[in-house]
């Protein structure tokens, strides 16, 4: 019976630390898509609707904040898109890019932790242009840190929720 | 406040060329595109082409491929429209129009005519 | 090609009516539609982008409904100045006008 007892307290000890391990998933936020055709940051995205969660780390002013120091990976997918219904490209040869930012407050400074992304011509013929990128990567991240995502021509971005979105989630303690 | 002045009337043989001034004023002519759009008598309008003024990059309708060349000149902030082998059929009002997307913003070419011109009546006859 | 359909292609009606326009896409076009007015011998003006939005300066009784392949214009109580052609537009494509006139 003691036997029993510790291993149903050690299953809660190790579920309530899963719990507690810090992650995040954001989906864009179609409705405030900012516009411009260089370089811009996306600062809406959703944190807790469809397929959006996040659990021990903060969102906001655009930026996922890390309340936990540790080893995260890090996440984001990026889709383009056009289709001639929406009109058409003023210039048919693009640069489509995504940037994950780090920001720390405590010693201001910002670094590209990632990059991805292509130079397209997407040809006025035809109907429809599609283009994906995603980027991963394992990271050390400290406490009030701030993960952000810039991307190029944000007009361009596909709103649906498995189509553009970033994430974070820690694997690991720093020792 | 935004205009776009058009020349004036014109008087063509068939087989002639014809070419269509578009003076704007009142906002920054190289972010935005302006489109070609005519209306024969009795007809629907029609949109003819556009200019990308910032870069110059221009579309046609496939229509006019070939008979039409669309030119503009930033430091006159003037359109210029083309049309060559003119026809009886080309008599019509052909009118100016900018589009509302503001290049600086974004790179659609959205189709929306927020200003147009007062339009100029190509009559094309022997 | 989107062929756009306009109808009625001309009507008639009273100071005050409720006058509705409508449009037909050949195939869906989500909800980039808009609507022009013409006069003769004036600027084409254009009335609603995007289906429903007001374009600036237009007067509130204008209306524009719709998403897909099929739109509506309203023009809530006619009013004397609004005796003109309507047209429909999408990207490259115009609808072949409804003349509006006061009976």
């Known amino acids: 019976e003691k036997a029993m007892v510790d291993g149903s307290w050690l299953d809660l000890a190790k579920r309530s630390k899963l719990e507690a391990q810090p992650f995040a998933h954001l989906t864009i936020n179609a409705t405030d898509i900012p516009s411009g055709s260089h370089k811009v940051s996306l600062s809406s995205w959703y944190h807790d609707r469809g397929w959006a969660k996040i659990s021990n780390m903060t969102f906001s002013n655009g930026k996922l904040i890390v309340n936990q120091d540790g080893f995260y990976y890090l996440y984001a997918n990026i889709c383009f898109r056009h289709h001639e219904t929406s009109g058409d490209l003023a210039t048919e040869y693009l640069q489509l890019m995504v940037y994950v930012t780090k920001t720390s407050i405590k010693i201001p400074s910002s670094h590209t932790l990632m990059k991805g992304g292509s130079t397209k011509y997407w040809s006025g013929n035809s109907e429809f242009h599609f283009y994906s990128i995603n980027v991963g990567g394992f990271f050390k991240l400290r406490s009030g840190e701030e993960i952000s995502i810039e991307v190029s021509n944000p007009s361009l971005l596909d709103p649906d929720q498995d189509a553009t979105y970033f994430g974070a989630f820690k694997v690991r303690d720093i020792d | 406040q935004v205009q776009l002045v058009q020349s004036g009337a014109e008087v063509r043989k068939p087989g002639a060329s014809v070419k269509v001034s578009c003076k704007a004023s009142g906002y920054d002519f190289s972010n935005y595109a302006i489109h070609w759009v005519r209306q024969a008598p009795g007809q629907r309008l029609e949109w003819m082409g556009w200019i990308n003024a910032g870069n110059g990059n221009t579309k046609f309708s496939q229509k006019f491929q070939g008979r039409i060349t669309v030119t503009r000149d930033t430091a006159a902030s003037t359109a210029y429209m083309e049309l060559r082998s003119l026809r009886s059929e080309d008599t019509a009002v052909y009118y100016c129009a900018r589009d509302t997307s503001n290049m600086v913003r974004g790179i659609i070419i959205a189709y929306y005519f927020d200003y147009w011109g007062q339009g100029t009546l190509v009559t094309v006859s022997s | 090609e989107i062929v756009m359909t306009q109808s009625p292609s001309s009507l008639s009606a009273s100071v005050g009516d409720r006058v509705t326009i409508t449009c037909r896409a050949s195939q869906s076009i989500s909800r980039y539609l808009n609507w022009y007015q013409l006069k003769p011998g004036k600027a084409p003006r254009l009335l609603i982008y995007g289906a429903s939005s007001l374009q600036s300066g237009v007067p509130s009784r204008f209306s524009g409904s719709g998403s897909g392949a099929e739109f509506t214009l309203t023009i809530s109580s006619l009013q004397p100045e609004d005796i003109a052609t309507y047209y429909c537009?999408?990207?490259?494509?115009f609808g072949q006008g409804t003349k509006v006139e006061i009976k």
């Open positions: 537009q999408h990207t490259r494509a």
